[in-house]
């Protein structure tokens, strides 16, 4: 799996999308987990409704929400009030029994809020897009990691 980078601004919301084959993953619940270290386990953050037919209902765990368009094949995770400690490697997963298939590996990067750091110089931050379900503005941009890029910094 390639890793997709999603960048968001601290204090704002970041929306992560994970497309998948709706027929291949029919009837399967989904989850969002955080990778603990390069070879560590993926720790569950939030999962979709325990009734698959209600997967579109937004489920929250703290500031993280998940919702699944099972017909369209898109899992959406919202990280509300993004903080620096939210940065890291995550996975979108499709669950079957005690097993989990990785739908997408995601690297979340948190950018400083330029309003809080006016001397940040040429700090780049993404454009705005209106969220359908919430009145607040979502910031997100994604790219795939280039070959050779490492999602985790080397440990000494």
């Amino acid at each position: 799996h390639n890793t997709t980078v999603f960048q968001g601004v601290a204090g704002q919301s970041l929306q992560v999308s994970c497309p998948y084959d709706s027929m291949k993953h029919w009837g399967r619940r989904k989850a969002w987990c955080r990778q603990l270290g390069e070879k560590g386990p993926c720790q569950r953050v939030v999962s979709t409704h325990n009734l698959w037919l209600l997967s579109f209902l937004r489920r929250w765990n703290g500031s993280t929400a998940i919702t699944d368009d099972t017909l369209g094949g898109t899992l959406t995770i919202t990280l509300r009030n993004l903080q620096p400690h939210d940065a890291g490697l995550y996975q979108c997963q499709s669950l079957h029994g005690s097993e989990a298939d990785t739908l997408r590996k995601v690297l979340v990067e948190v950018l400083a809020d330029p309003l809080d750091h006016r001397d940040a110089g040429d700090l780049w931050f993404p454009g705005e897009s209106e969220s359908f379900e919430d009145a607040h503005v979502e910031h997100s941009i994604s790219r795939s990691l280039l070959e050779g890029e490492i999602p985790f910094p080397p440990t000494s």
Epitope: H49, N50, L51, L53, L54, L57, W60, D69, T70, L71
Partner: antibody, heavy 126, light 106 residues
């Protein structure tokens, strides 16, 4: 008039089977999730299970106590939802209701049930 | 499973009284809660969905509020035809009902 009518209830011995029917009229049956509930004599309401709209291809969900014994199905051409009950137990004795899930859009619905049938009594006894 | 504790289990009030029923969830259920009315020998009737939305055709004296774990159902002015048992139903995790509140006229 939007209506649901259950049928098929009756007296049955433990371990036997029974099939309930829920005939819908007055609305586009294929567009709605359909659910079954039950109410034991003098008790509260209990969700049994439901089946998704046609878009969800007959996918079903059940409460733990009936999983593996009960099966919900639907026939869009007849606008009928079924509850097939196998290996019946005395604790399955109840009035069984079918109900329609409230629909928001093609994809979204809410498990609020806005149309109910009159109910059919199922008695499991030897 | 999520437990729904409904209170009181029964109440007696006069016509015109304001009646309040509460439903407490054993964990946060957002606003994933509905309220039903059931008259003796009849099927339940949906009154309120998603905690606070009044179902079409339901009189405006019925209302619902709350989010998280604590929810309230109110009849602003009790009418004789409101004699029934009222149930809350959550759908945050599976579907479960409260034990019901039987409303009678004094």
């Amino acid at each position: 008039e939007v209506q649901l009518v259950e049928s098929g209830g009756g007296l049955v011995q433990p371990g036997r089977s029974l099939r309930l029917s829920c005939t819908a009229s007055g609305f586009t049956f294929d567009d709605h999730a359909m659910s079954w509930f039950r109410q034991a004599p003098g008790k509260g309401l209990e969700w049994v299970g439901f089946i998704g709209s046609k878009a969800y291809g007959g996918t079903t969900e059940y409460t733990a106590s009936v999983k593996g014994r009960f099966t919900i199905s639907r026939d869009g051409s007849k606008s009928i939802a079924y509850l097939q009950m196998n290996s019946l137990k005395t604790e399955d004795t109840a009035v069984y209701y079918c109900a329609r899930g409230k629909r928001y859009s093609y994809t979204y619905w809410t498990p609020a049930f806005d149309v109910w049938g009159q109910g059919t009594m199922v008695t499991v006894s030897s | 499973d999520i437990q729904m504790t409904q209170s009181p289990s029964s109440l007696s009030a006069s016509v015109g009284d304001r009646v309040t029923i509460t439903c407490q969830a054993s964990q946060d259920i957002t606003n994933y809660l509905n309220w039903y009315q059931q008259k003796p020998g009849k099927a339940p009737k949906l009154l309120i969905y998603d905690a606070s939305n009044l179902e079409t055709g339901v009189p405006s004296r019925f209302s619902g509020s709350g989010s998280g774990t604590d929810f309230t159902f109110t009849i602003s002015s009790l009418q004789p035809e409101d004699i029934a048992t009222y149930y809350c139903q959550q759908y945050d995790s599976y579907l479960t009902f409260g034990g019901g509140t039987k409303v009678e006229i004094k």
